[in-house]
């Protein structure tokens, strides 16, 4: 009866350079329980080598010399007593490519090389990239542990060296970036930046890297309000904006955050549950009315918090003037000027281009001002007759502009009301 030596092992296996592979293997050999029990030794050899002289690539025999180039990288895994000859190959090198055969020895009776079942190992170029693991989403200000690992790599062979690069790492100690793990406290400005983990096998030319784009979740830090593409100045969460009455107004509220905050506009200073007047970052007023003077609030709502800014809208108008008109009354020549403006304008009367300020000490003229609704009225009373033709002007102005009107008083006319010549702007 022929002794039965059998080996189950795959014919070929492919592994990328620098990675690891486990080759399952089982064997059988003729053994009788009545034999003596010398130790069972198993070996993996390079094909073409004579087992009696060659250094082994892996063995459980402590007396056999292992090839220095495979020492620690080729290992027997599993229990050989249970006929397990599985071979673990770590930190695969191009020069490992080739065929290998298995051999069993037990005393003088069992010695056999399984030359019919060779393992063909092919080591190919490394294309595997490392994985960067972390709990998503990254939150601004919250420390997060990141780890870098290469699928298919193992502890065998020289240690792996790591290097991390990226703008988010600038404050880190360089030593920290040489570990497979690092703790990162992302900032809002790190969102969208690249983080790269590079792995290299010490003493080898095998290098691989992966780059990820950081998705940093952060609440809005600032709100900016734009008008015609120009940012409004903001002081203590309030922005002041003067708007010409009747003008169309389009404001854009921007609050950089990730994911984008929900932007809305409210009238005045709203309560948290108030209803917005706009559910976007855009506030449009077709014609600004003075009634809208006061404020609007832009609120940026975000899962990580909210921010809001108050817009103090001041509605202004250029002075509008009616007059002057003059008429003779009992006490003398009576001229009236009506005007309207926001903010309230200042007004002055001129007689022949000379300003008339307050009331004359000699009583030659008197100025009276009153207001009713949006209009304000001023009157000028000139006592005494006119010596010659006169030009009476009134001028209204505020910080936004001015308007003036004048009337020519012709000597000898009894009714001056018809001779009103309103001044052009």
């Amino acid at each position: 009866e022929k002794p039965v030596y059998e080996l189950q092992v795959q014919k070929s296996v492919t592994v990328q350079e620098g990675l690891c592979v486990l080759v399952p293997c089982s064997f059988s050999y003729p053994w009788r329980s009545w034999y003596s029990s010398p130790p069972l030794y198993v070996y993996w050899f390079r094909d073409g080598e004579i087992p009696y002289y060659a250094e082994v690539v892996a063995t459980n025999n402590p007396d056999r010399r292992v090839k220095p180039e495979t020492q620690g990288r080729f290992r027997l895994l599993g229990d050989v007593q249970k006929k397990n000859c599985s071979l673990s190959i770590g930190d695969a090198r191009m020069e490992d490519t080739g065929s290998y055969f298995f051999r069993v020895e037990r005393g003088r009776d069992v010695k056999y090389s399984y030359q019919q079942n060779k393992l063909n190992l092919e080591v190919t170029a490394l294309i595997e990239k490392p994985d960067i693991h972390f709990l998503e989403p990254l939150e601004s200000g919250r420390p997060t542990r990141l780890s870098c690992s290469l699928p298919g790599s193992c502890e065998a062979g020289p240690p792996l060296t790591f290097s991390w690069t990226g703008n988010a790492l600038s404050p880190l100690d360089p030593e920290t970036t040489r570990s497979s793990e690092l703790t990162l406290t992302p900032r809002p400005e790190d969102h969208g930046t690249n983080l790269t983990c590079q792995m290299k096998r010490q003493g080898a030319q095998v290098t691989t890297e992966r780059t990820v784009q950081l998705n940093v979740s952060y609440a809005p830090q600032t709100i900016t309000i734009f008008r015609n593409g120009i940012a409004l100045e903001i002081l203590q969460n309030t922005s002041y904006l003067p708007v010409l009455e009747g003008q169309a107004l389009r404001l854009l509220c921007d609050a950089p955050s990730n994911p984008p905050a929900h932007l809305s506009w409210f009238q005045g200073s709203p309560a948290l549950n108030a209803t917005p007047i706009s559910n976007t970052g855009i506030l449009e007023l077709r014609r600004v009315r003075s009634a809208e003077e006061g404020g609007f609030t832009c609120r940026a709502q975000h899962p990580l918090g909210f921010l809001q800014i108050f817009l103090n809208l001041s509605v202004y108008s250029l002075p509008q003037l009616l007059g002057p008109s003059c008429s003779w009354e009992a006490e003398g020549l009576h001229c009236r000027c009506s005007f309207r403006a926001r903010p309230a304008p200042s007004l002055c009367w001129r007689l022949e281009e000379k300003p008339l300020e307050g009331n004359s000490s000699q009583g030659s003229f008197k100025v009276n001002s009153s207001s009713a609704g949006p209009w304000a009225n001023s009157s000028l009373i000139l006592h005494g007759g006119l010596s010659s033709d006169l030009k009476v002007s009134c001028k209204a102005w505020n910080i936004y502009g001015s308007q003036s009107g004048s009337v020519l008083l012709l000597q000898g006319r009894s009714n001056l009301g018809t001779g009103v010549v309103p001044a052009a702007l």
Epitope: Y5, I50, Y52, Y53, R64, R65, K111, Y112
Partner: antibody
Framework: QVQLQQSGGGLVKPGTSVKLSCKAS????????IHWVKQRSGQGLEWIGW????????KYNEKFKDKATLTADKSSSTVYMELSRLTSEDSAVYFC????????????WGQGTSVTVSS | DVLMTQTPLSLPVSLGDQASISCRCS???????????LEWYLQKPGQSPKLLIY???NRFSGVPDRFSGSGSGTDFTLKISRVEAEDLGVYYC?????????FGGGTKLEIK
């Protein structure tokens, strides 16, 4: 029990060839290296070469490279040594020896076969 | 080639005496795998050689313990503690570390 049975040899004419055989039994044929050793009458031992059926590995002593050719037939578990262009210098007893194991020794020997080269 | 020099060529002994044979190699016979393949064989008249010692100092199975081997590098010794009649014959040292493998010239152990 490992046995190496030798045959062939005898009286041969100069300039001819002779093929010696060494038939193995009692072990797995591919597991032994078979060596050939020459011993001239009253002289010492000389290693000719080896044949390892496991991987068909053959090694020669340079001195015998043009003299001896080693082959094998796995089906009959036999290793052969052919000696060519015989001269009187080739008259000797030729042994085959089995070498198995890491210990590197020729632990089993054939009985030897005599070759006499004479016209 | 590694030259193996055995001394003495002839060693006359009385039965029960100790015998010692020396073998000197022309170069180190440590194999690239770390082993030293130095062996001793005994050839009795009309017989094939028989293995006594392998790898310098290991006795082959069935070899009596009166045989012992020692040495390292280039100098090796075979000792027989108490010579018996069956020990007579020619002793050869042999190196299997470097091709071509080579034998010593032989030492004849004979009765005084």
């Amino acid at each position: 029990q490992v046995q190496l049975q030798q045959s062939g040899g005898g009286l041969v004419k100069p300039g001819t060839s002779v093929k010696l055989s060494c038939k193995a039994s009692g072990y797995i044929f591919t597991e032994y290296i078979i060596h050939w050793v020459k011993q001239r009458s009253g002289q010492g031992l000389e290693w000719i070469g080896w044949f390892y059926p496991g991987i068909i590995s053959i090694k020669y002593n340079e001195k015998f490279k043009d003299k001896a050719t080693l082959t094998a037939d796995k089906s009959s578990s036999t290793v052969y040594m052919e000696l060519s262009r015989l001269t009187s210098e080739d008259s000797a007893v030729y042994f085959c020896a089995g070498h198995e194991g890491y210990d590197g020794a020729m632990d089993y020997w054939g009985q030897g076969t005599s070759v006499t080269v004479s016209s | 080639d590694v030259l193996m020099t055995q001394t003495p060529l002839s060693l006359p002994v009385s039965l029960g005496d100790q015998a010692s044979i020396s073998c000197r190699c022309s170069q180190s016979i440590v194999h690239s795998n770390g082993n030293t393949y130095l062996e001793w064989y005994l050839q009795k008249p009309g017989q094939s050689p028989k293995l006594l010692i392998y790898r310098v100092s290991n006795r082959f199975s069935g070899v009596p313990d009166r045989f012992s081997g020692s040495g390292s590098g280039t100098d090796f010794t075979l000792k027989i503690s108490r010579v018996e009649a069956e020990d007579l014959g020619v002793y050869y040292c042999f190196q299997g570390s470097h091709v071509p493998w080579t034998f010593g010239g032989g030492t004849k152990l004979e009765i005084k």
